[in-house]
Interface confidence: medium
């Protein structure tokens, strides 16, 4: 296999393959519960687990929630796909001042160049408008009246917005926070950044730093302050906390400045398909006792299904893994990750990701 000669329905009578007339070759038939990653799979590795809608299969073969672009200042750049998250970006007229994984934690309106400045580079979803001094012989036919002002002393290479107090701020420099839609009309009336030294003559502070949160007394820890419902990840990026809004989820730990909210299945349910800091699918089942882990199994038996080829070893619940390895830990909980194809990251791949707390009760696999 593949075969180039047509066979109706079967390929040499092999039940694990079928003939695809469209591509005129024999293709591997994915076992039940697994879905093909291409039109004509050739081997078991061309089959993948199916995640719930609005989840994608991450690099560790875990079902992970796609980010949502539901905030007023965000729009969808790329949709949620089977193997990649939805990507959000700031809506037109705004740029991202504090990035988040696959999204933006804080969007600002593009600055309008002040008097004496003209647009060098228009603002994008990622970058603010870049201004440059107007040449003495600038044509009156300017794109914007604001860009036709007489040159003034002092130049700024980029009009960098700052989250300043509303009394001195224009809409062009105000962040739009979740749930608040600033009317474009208001933004168009307040077009020019204030001609003050704080906004024109010198660079502002990092928009990601909260001006309302001074350093703690006796501490130099002026950490980056993320938007509500975002946390600062290990790479220093503001990352959206997961949501526990699904009926079968409850909040285990809240969204903190440096850690995501974590969700777990509500009482009486356990996690059958893990998601980072959450659970993609909760099912009303118990799991192995606290002392047990699941034996590794052959690739052919991952997500053991109707037609899983009878290869490899049988996965059982045993006191210790067959290979003597201790169960892998994925913080914050000790976890029995038994997701399909999770062997890339953990030595105990079978089929329903669950975790055990120190009490032996099932808790969510935080991924």
């Amino acid at each position: 296999f593949p075969q180039d000669r047509p066979f109706e329905d079967t390929c040499h009578g092999n039940p694990s393959h079928y003939y695809d007339k469209a591509v005129r070759r024999c293709c591997y038939r994915c076992p039940m519960g697994l879905f093909p990653t291409q039109q004509c799979p050739q081997r078991p590795t061309d089959c993948r687990k199916q995640c719930e809608p609005d989840y994608y299969l991450d690099e560790a073969d875990r079902c992970t929630a796609c980010v949502t672009c539901s905030r007023d200042d965000l729009v969808e750049k790329t949709p949620c796909a089977w193997n990649s998250s939805r990507v959000c970006e700031c809506r037109p007229g705004m740029f991202c001042s504090t990035s988040a994984v696959n999204s933006c934690a804080r969007c600002f309106f593009h600055s309008v160049c002040p008097a004496g400045m003209i647009v060098k580079f228009p603002g994008t979803a990622q970058k603010n408008t870049v201004c440059e001094p107007a040449s003495p012989g600038v044509s009156p036919a300017c794109a914007s009246p604001e860009n036709c002002k007489e040159p003034s002393s002092g130049t700024i290479p980029q009009a960098k917005p700052t989250p300043v107090s509303p009394a001195t701020s224009s809409a062009s420099t105000m962040p739009v926070r979740g749930g608040t839609r600033l009317a474009q009309e208001a933004a168009s009336k307040l077009t020019r950044a204030p001609d003050s030294p704080s906004s024109v003559g010198r660079p502002s502070s990092d928009p990601g730093l909260s001006p309302t949160q001074p350093c703690p007394e006796g501490s130099g820890d002026c950490r980056k302050q993320c938007e509500p419902d975002y946390y600062l990840d290990e790479a220093g990026r503001c990352t959206a906390c997961v949501s526990c809004s699904r009926d079968d989820l409850v909040e285990k730990t809240p969204c903190a400045w440096n850690s995501s909210r974590t969700c777990e299945c509500r009482p009486g349910m356990i996690c059958a398909t893990s998601a980072t800091n959450s659970c993609a699918r909760c099912v009303p089942y118990p799991i192995c006792a606290a002392e047990t882990v699941t034996k590794p199994q052959d690739m052919a038996e991952k997500d053991t299904t109707f037609e899983a080829p009878p290869l490899g070893t049988q996965p059982d619940c045993n006191p210790t893994p067959e290979n003597g390895e201790a169960p892998a830990s994925t913080s914050p909980t000790q976890s029995l990750l038994v997701d399909s194809q999770a062997s890339k990251t953990l030595p105990i791949p079978t089929s329903a990701p669950v975790a055990l707390s120190s009490t032996g009760k099932p808790v969510l696999d935080a991924g």
Epitope: M32, F35, P36, Q50, F306, P310, Q314, D316, A352
Partner: antibody, heavy 117, light 108 residues
């Protein structure tokens, strides 16, 4: 709450056809594999057919070539088209959800198919 | 004739422990998980044991499953009258799914 409701059973003559339906609710239908399992009167359970990815279908040898399983994810419905029916196909046909290695975790109440002249 | 072999009947008195066996081959039980289903009279089957020895929520811990090689067994301890039912073992085989012939359990 997960619910599976079969319909379409009835009396049919040998050689005839019948189409069974299974209406699913309470879960994301398109994300699960589904199956038909039958039980002849006073007999044991027999797996008939399964469906995963839309064009990936699976059949017991006893029905291969005569039965066709299909699904309509937009209607959350599973189907079993039964042609060339035989007396030995007489059974209660159950629709069952299959989830990874949990097996058939939810079953419908079944619909009776009687093949008799 | 079923691919998996079960005794057609078993019986016990209330409080007793009863074991139902299921014998297969390397292509089904030997290389895959075993499941047990309970079918009470006049009702649809219900998942009783999955992944050889795991119980779904709601299934009493009186029910336990085990597997060794190409055989599996279901044990019911502290037998009750409501346990009177048909019990089926099941396993995968290459590209299909097989059931045992079923065991009728009678509570005397």
């Amino acid at each position: 709450e997960v619910q599976l409701l079969e319909s379409g059973g009835g009396l049919v003559q040998p050689g005839g056809s019948l189409r069974l339906s299974c209406a699913a609710s309470g879960f994301t239908f398109s994300s699960y594999s589904m199956s038909w399992v039958r039980q002849a009167p006073g007999k044991g359970l027999e797996w008939v057919s399964g469906i995963g990815y839309p064009y990936y279908t699976y059949y017991a040898d006893s029905v291969k070539g005569r039965f066709t399983i299909s699904r309509d994810n937009s209607k959350n419905t599973l189907y079993l088209q039964m042609n060339s029916l035989r007396a030995e196909d007489t059974a209660v046909y159950y629709c069952a959800r299959y989830y990874y290695d949990y097996g058939f975790d939810y079953w419908g109440q079944g619909t009776l198919v009687t093949v008799s002249s | 004739q079923s691919v998996l072999t079960q005794p057609p009947s078993a019986s016990g008195t209330p409080g007793q422990r009863v074991t139902i066996s299921c014998s297969g081959s390397s292509s089904n039980i030997g290389s895959n998980y075993v499941y047990w289903y309970q079918q009470l009279p006049g009702t649809a089957p219900k998942l009783l044991i999955y992944r050889n020895n795991q119980r779904p929520s709601g299934v009493p811990d009186r029910f336990s499953g085990s597997k060794s090689g190409t055989s599996a067994s279901l044990a019911i301890s502290g037998l009750r009258s409501e346990d009177e039912a048909d019990y089926y073992c099941a396993a995968y085989r290459s590209y299909d799914y097989v059931f045992g012939g079923g065991t009728k359990l009678t509570v005397l």
